[in-house]
């Protein structure tokens, strides 16, 4: 059956032979209606990439550099299955490219000029492409030929396989630049030995190199890693201090109509029958015909790449930056230590309009990028299409798991001038009901619920976390009869109450009328039994404070709070009747952009913050008529975090634990991708 066939692309006679064997052995173990293999032979991996894009083949396994080529237009391929190494219990699908130095040296990443460098080899990922790609814009001009620029940047190097005649400085630490193990400083172990012997000041290797060469922890403690933010960390902190995370070997397919489920079904069955130590007659991860045919011989199996993970996310911002710099050879005109405009991520058109107004008023220091969901915005910040946005705590958690960092906190209670330096305790997550109802915390089953959005703190993580510990399952759509929780599956009962309009029904952005704090409260007013919001929501939308038709006549006394002990209290008493304390919303950014974002925002709030009194004729950063666009409308200022500069420290142990527990109920495709 052609639609059940996966056309595998082979790049040599030997690969084609193994592919045919793969096809025949899979036929013998799979049912006739199951997936099958067909083999397509091409001259090179690049030809395979083009064939897949043209729908002449379906899959091929590629190294990281080729995954980058496959992702570029017009190919637009995506990673669908990753090879893993190590054990099934602790599968490794990536390695980390690191810069190792001796502990007793005192320079940082931005002080490498004039040092001596040790590389694994010319054109190799961890030893050359990544470090030189990331340093590219610091290299002296002209940057072509690249080897000459590198030779002039470092005071001496060992770059195995370089041309020692044309570029003698690249071979200064290893005469001749031998391209095999005859050169004692060749490859990973060699580059590390070059550092260890004192020949070089820095070695560009992979994270495992130091562990493979120094079994003793005391010996390893004599070394450190250089981080991109110009700090250092111990060698075991490579996940937080590396030049790039590099995928090892990946199966790619078309982004649209790519048969990824079929490819996974095929490879999953293949590893069951012909994986490591499974079969004598055919082995997926070895071959009598040659090395690394179709798959790496060192692979132990396959893992499905999460569907939300596109090539940009898979390769990572640092890796793409390095490779793009090397390939395109372009550098910003501005010096790299100067802050470029900050690209703010705006959700849908309401936020985009406010962001545009901010952009005009900031004289272009703020630029705007749009996405339809918060998760899409976080992904854009991860891959460099955007730089920053302000997030509810639930999304600060997801952003943190995806490598972003909190930069500034929204403060709601501290008057100026102390606001900028004050760390507030947070706000209260509350459950609001109509005073006329007889609801309590204990009889919510079967009622109609209103949520700010799935994944947000007051509207979801806190109430659903509490509910989960009571009902011990994730079927919240069965607990409530119906509701509006923007971001739920469209056919879920938790979208039934949403107002839309139609194509935007239940979307987690302002196009859905019941989105956010004000939207969830409106849902309660018009349709629901209980709304999960922040403690300020009722006062901010009653007594004529919200002029919208649905809100202008509402009275605060018509609403009450549900307390966890089964009682109810006035909305004026959130301190004695709340579900939990929630961390304030916070601005997040990539680590490399955090300082610029902080500096710019502090400057912007001095001009457009709460000190502006007339928002009808001046731009106000924290104003959008109860819509909480870009920032919460009740923000007094953006405050420095001081030492609360990681998502764990910012959110606090208790909240992180609560959200981690709720992860078993997670519907976040981005979180799944970021924890892959």
């Amino acid at each position: 059956v052609p639609e059940k066939s996966v056309r595998w692309c082979a790049v040599s006679e030997h690969e084609a032979t193994k592919c045919q064997s793969f096809r025949d052995h899979m036929k013998s173990v799979l049912p006739s209606n199951g997936p099958s293999v067909a083999c397509v032979k091409k001259a090179s991996h690049l030809d395979c990439i083009r064939a897949i894009a043209a729908n002449e083949a379906d899959a091929v396994t590629l190294d990281a550099g080729l995954v980058y080529d496959a992702y570029l237009a017009p190919n637009n391929l995506k990673p669908v299955v990753a090879e893993f190494y190590g054990s099934k219990e602790d599968p490794q699908t990536f390695y980390y490219a690191v810069a190792v130095v001796k502990k007793d040296s005192d320079f940082q990443m931005n002080q490498l000029r004039g040092r001596k460098s040790c590389h694994t080899g010319l054109g190799r990922s961890a030893g050359w492409n990544i470090p030189i790609g990331l340093l590219y814009c610091d290299l002296p001009e002209p940057r072509k030929p690249l080897e000459k620029a590198v030779a002039n940047f470092f005071s001496g190097s060992c770059v195995p396989c370089a041309d020692g005649t044309d570029f003698p400085q690249l071979c200064q630490l290893c005469p001749g630049c031998g391209c095999s193990t005859l050169n004692q400083y060749f490859s990973y172990s060699g580059a590390f030995k070059c550092l260890k012997d004192g020949a070089g000041d820095v070695a560009f290797v992979k994270h495992s190199t130091i562990f493979e060469n120094l079994a003793n922890k005391a010996d390893r403690d004599q070394y450190e890693l250089l981080c991109l933010d110009n700090t250092r960390k111990s060698v075991d902190e490579y996940k937080d201090c590396h030049l790039a995370r590099v995928p090892s070997h990946t199966v790619v397919a078309r982004s649209v109509g790519g048969k990824e489920d079929l490819i996974w079904e095929l490879l999953n069955q293949a590893q069951e029958h012909f994986g490591k130590d499974k079969s004598k007659e055919f082995q997926l991860f070895s071959s009598p015909h040659g090395k690394d045919l179709l798959f790496k011989d060192s692979a132990h199996g396959f893992l499905k790449v999460p569907p939300r993970m596109d090539a940009k996310m898979y390769l990572g911002y640092e890796y793409i930056t390095a490779i793009r710099n090397l390939r395109e050879g372009t550098c910003p005109e501005a010096p790299t230590d100067e802050c470029k405009p900050v690209k703010w991520c705006a959700l849908s058109h309401h936020e985009r309009l406010k962001c545009d107004e901010w952009s005009v008023n900031s004289a272009g220091k703020i630029e705007c990028e749009s996405a339809e969901t918060t998760e899409d915005c976080i992904a854009k910040i991860m891959n460099g299409e955007a730089d920053a946005m302000s997030l509810d705590g639930g999304f600060v958690y997801i952003a943190g798991m995806c490598g972003l960092v909190p930069v500034l906190a929204e403060n709601y209670n501290t008057p100026n001038p102390n606001c900028e330096n004050t760390a507030e305790e947070g706000y209260f997550a509350v459950a609001v009901v109509k005073s006329s109802s007889d609801l309590t915390w204990d009889n919510l089953k079967g009622k109609k619920s209103c949520h700010t959005a799935v994944g947000r703190t007051a509207g979801w993580n806190i109430p659903m976390g509490l509910l989960y510990s009571k009902i011990n399952h994730c079927r919240f759509d069965e607990f409530f009869s119906e509701g509006c929780a923007p971001g739920s599956e469209k056919n879920s009962s938790l979208c039934k109450l949403c107002m839309g309009p139609s194509p935007n029904l239940c979307e987690p952005n302002n196009k859905e009328g019941y989105y956010g704090y004000t939207g969830a409260f409106r849902c309660l007013v018009e349709k629901g039994d209980v709304a999960f919001v922040k403690h300020q929501t009722v006062p901010q939308n009653t007594g004529g404070k919200n002029p919208d038709a649905w809100a202008k006549n509402l009275k605060e006394e018509d609403y009450e709070l549900l307390c966890l002990d089964g009682s109810r209290k006035s909305v004026q008493e959130p301190a004695n009747c709340h579900l939990a304390r929630a961390p304030n919303h916070a601005v997040v950014a990539r680590k490399d952009k955090a300082d610029c974002v902080q500096t710019l925002l502090l400057d912007q709030q001095r001009m457009f913050g709460s000190s502006v009194t007339d928002c009808s004729s001046n731009f106000c950063l924290f104003e959008s008529k109860t819509k909480d666009l870009l920032f919460r409308d009740d923000t007094v200022c953006l405050a420095k975090l001081h030492d609360r500069n990681t998502y764990e420290k910012y959110l606090g142990e208790e909240y992180v634990k609560a959200v981690t527990n709720l992860r078993k109920c997670s519907t976040s495709p981005l979180l799944e991708a970021c924890t892959f």
Epitope: L353, K354, V360, N361, S617, F619
Partner: nanobody, 117 residues
Amino acid sequence: QVKLEESGGGLVQPGGSLRLSCAASGSIFSIATMAWYRQAPGKQRELVAGITRSGSTNYRDSVKGRFTISRDNAKNTMYLQMNSLKPEDTAVYYCTDYSSRYYHDYWGQGTQVTVSS
């Protein structure tokens, strides 16, 4: 709500010029920021240029040096002078103000600009 009406569009050859006007009914002096947007067929609406109450301006990169935004508060009018027009400037041009702070997606009829030889 301030009502805005765009005019001045038309068909022009590459390299030519046009001046768009945006007339406001009601006083625009109190409006903080005004802007011109454009939308080409099948594309998202995009900010072209904006002007604050104090007269400071901002332009999208592709029009810098070619377009000039201005406003005349006495006449309740905002302008967009477009020089060295290119085929890629072809779009419907809209003016907007952000005075309501609601940031609703309300737009007028716009004025069609076509750059073609």
